[in-house]
């Protein structure tokens, strides 16, 4: 019989008034030996499912069921996956701010709309929180001495059009 709880291994508990290492009871764990009690194992139920089962030395780990995501340290809460037009923040699902969009279900971040003018294109369809803008064809700006080559679909030849 030992005289101290100091030598107890994880997976056991020990009482100072009766210093013997005892195995943790079912559904409990102790990651540090020599503690006066073992801790109740976490149960993953409802919106949670087991990611890792409880052992005598480690608590269970939970994750969220399909269609939900974890919030908080050690996945303390499950929240419905974000819809298109939202992104996941520490505070939960937040609607994309003006000028940004997310077209993915459950994942992804809000990304800025495409800047059509950078490609020399016009905006054909304005963006929403769920969809990017649709850019039109390149804008033709007629300036002096611009040469446009036109190649008819049918043949290899082309006509040159000089704009004065």
């Amino acid at each position: 019989v030992q005289n101290s709880c100091d030598n107890c291994q994880p997976g056991t508990f020990c009482r100072k008034y009766n210093p013997v290492c005892k195995s943790c009871p079912p559904s409990t764990f102790s990651s540090i030996g020599g503690q006066p009690n073992c801790n109740i194992c976490r149960v993953c139920a409802g919106y949670f499912r087991f990611k890792k089962f409880c052992s005598s030395t480690h608590n269970a780990e939970c994750e969220c069921i399909e269609g939900f995501h974890c919030l908080g340290p050690q996945c303390t809460r499950c929240e419905k996956d974000c819809r298109p037009g939202q992104e996941l923040t520490k505070q939960g699902c937040k609607t994309c701010s003006l000028g940004t969009f997310n077209d993915q279900n459950g994942t992804g971040v809000c990304r800025p709309w495409t800047n059509c003018s950078l490609d020399g294109r016009s905006v054909l369809k304005t963006g929403t929180t769920e969809k990017d803008v649709v850019c039109g064809p390149p804008v033709v700006s007629f300036s002096p001495s611009t040469t446009i080559s036109v190649t008819p679909e049918g043949g290899p030849g082309g006509h040159s059009l000089q704009v004065l």
Epitope: R15, K16, C24, N37, C38, N39
Partner: antibody
Framework: EMQLVESGGGLVQPGRSMKLSCAGS????????VAWVRQAPKKGLEWVAY????????YYRESVKGRFTISRDNAKSTLYLQMDSLRSEDTATYYC?????????????????WGPGTMVTVSS | DIQMTQSPSLLSASVGDRVTLNCRTS??????LAWYQQKLGEAPKLLIY???SLQAGIPSRFSGSGSGTDFTLTISSLQPEDVATYFC????????FGAGTNLELK
């Protein structure tokens, strides 16, 4: 030396109140779930009330619910049992005991450390 | 509530005898059963927990066995200081004690 000592017992009239105390010394009583177990004269044992180590959870046997209150003062390493509306059938030796199960649990208790007990007699 | 039946209620035996005390529960309690010894004028003392685990400091002549609904406390060689009342207790569902077996010397 590690010990539990009950006090506060005695003779009380039916319908009156009494408060029992249990002092732990030589170890940290606040680390453990603690229960009161009683034994009527020449009879068997029955648990009366239980309180978890931090005091957040309490359980009572059906016959004392609403009349008895278990509490603890961890700073003083003391456990209490407030007994109101006492009946003759509450006459017993009341023992303060530590839950040996080791699981911070509700209801799975065996008792591996006992005080010597204090006698409560309810009689007119 | 789970009912506990201890038998016999009174047992007379001689020093050196092998003594067997029985405890039966009305429902399956698996191995959630403890045995206590109570000497006259004293508080009970835990002997066995989890049906067969010997509490530290208890002499090895005491042993527990059983699982489910039928349990046994055995004293391999009775000593004069073993004269006492022995209680079983289930802690699977709530807590209930048996009425006790009074062990005396012949």
């Amino acid at each position: 030396e590690m010990q539990l000592v009950e006090s506060g017992g005695g003779l009380v009239q039916p319908g009156r109140s009494m408060k029992l105390s249990c002092a732990g010394s030589g170890f940290t009583l606040s680390d453990y779930g603690v229960a009161w177990v009683r034994q009527a004269p020449k009879k068997g044992l029955e648990w009366v009330a239980y309180i978890s180590y931090a005091g957040g959870t309490t359980y009572y046997r059906e016959s004392v619910k609403g009349r008895f209150t278990i509490s603890r003062d961890n700073a003083k390493s003391t456990l209490y049992l407030q007994m109101d509306s006492l009946r003759s059938e509450d006459t017993a030796t009341y023992y303060c005991t530590i839950d040996g199960y080791g699981g911070y649990s509700g209801s799975h208790w065996y008792f591996d450390f006992w005080g010597p007990g204090t006698m409560v007699t309810v009689s007119s | 509530d789970i009912q506990m039946t201890q038998s016999p209620s009174l047992l007379s035996a001689s020093v050196g005898d092998r003594v067997t005390l029985n405890c039966r529960t009305s429902q399956n309690v698996y191995k959630n059963l403890a045995w206590y010894q109570q000497k006259l004028g004293e508080a009970p003392k835990l002997l066995i927990y989890n049906a067969n685990s010997l509490q530290a400091g208890i002499p090895s002549r005491f042993s527990g066995s059983g699982s489910g609904t039928d349990f046994t406390l055995t004293i391999s060689s009775l000593q004069p200081e073993d004269v006492a009342t022995y209680f079983c207790q289930q802690y699977y569902s709530g807590n209930t004690f048996g009425a006790g077996t009074n062990l005396e010397l012949k």
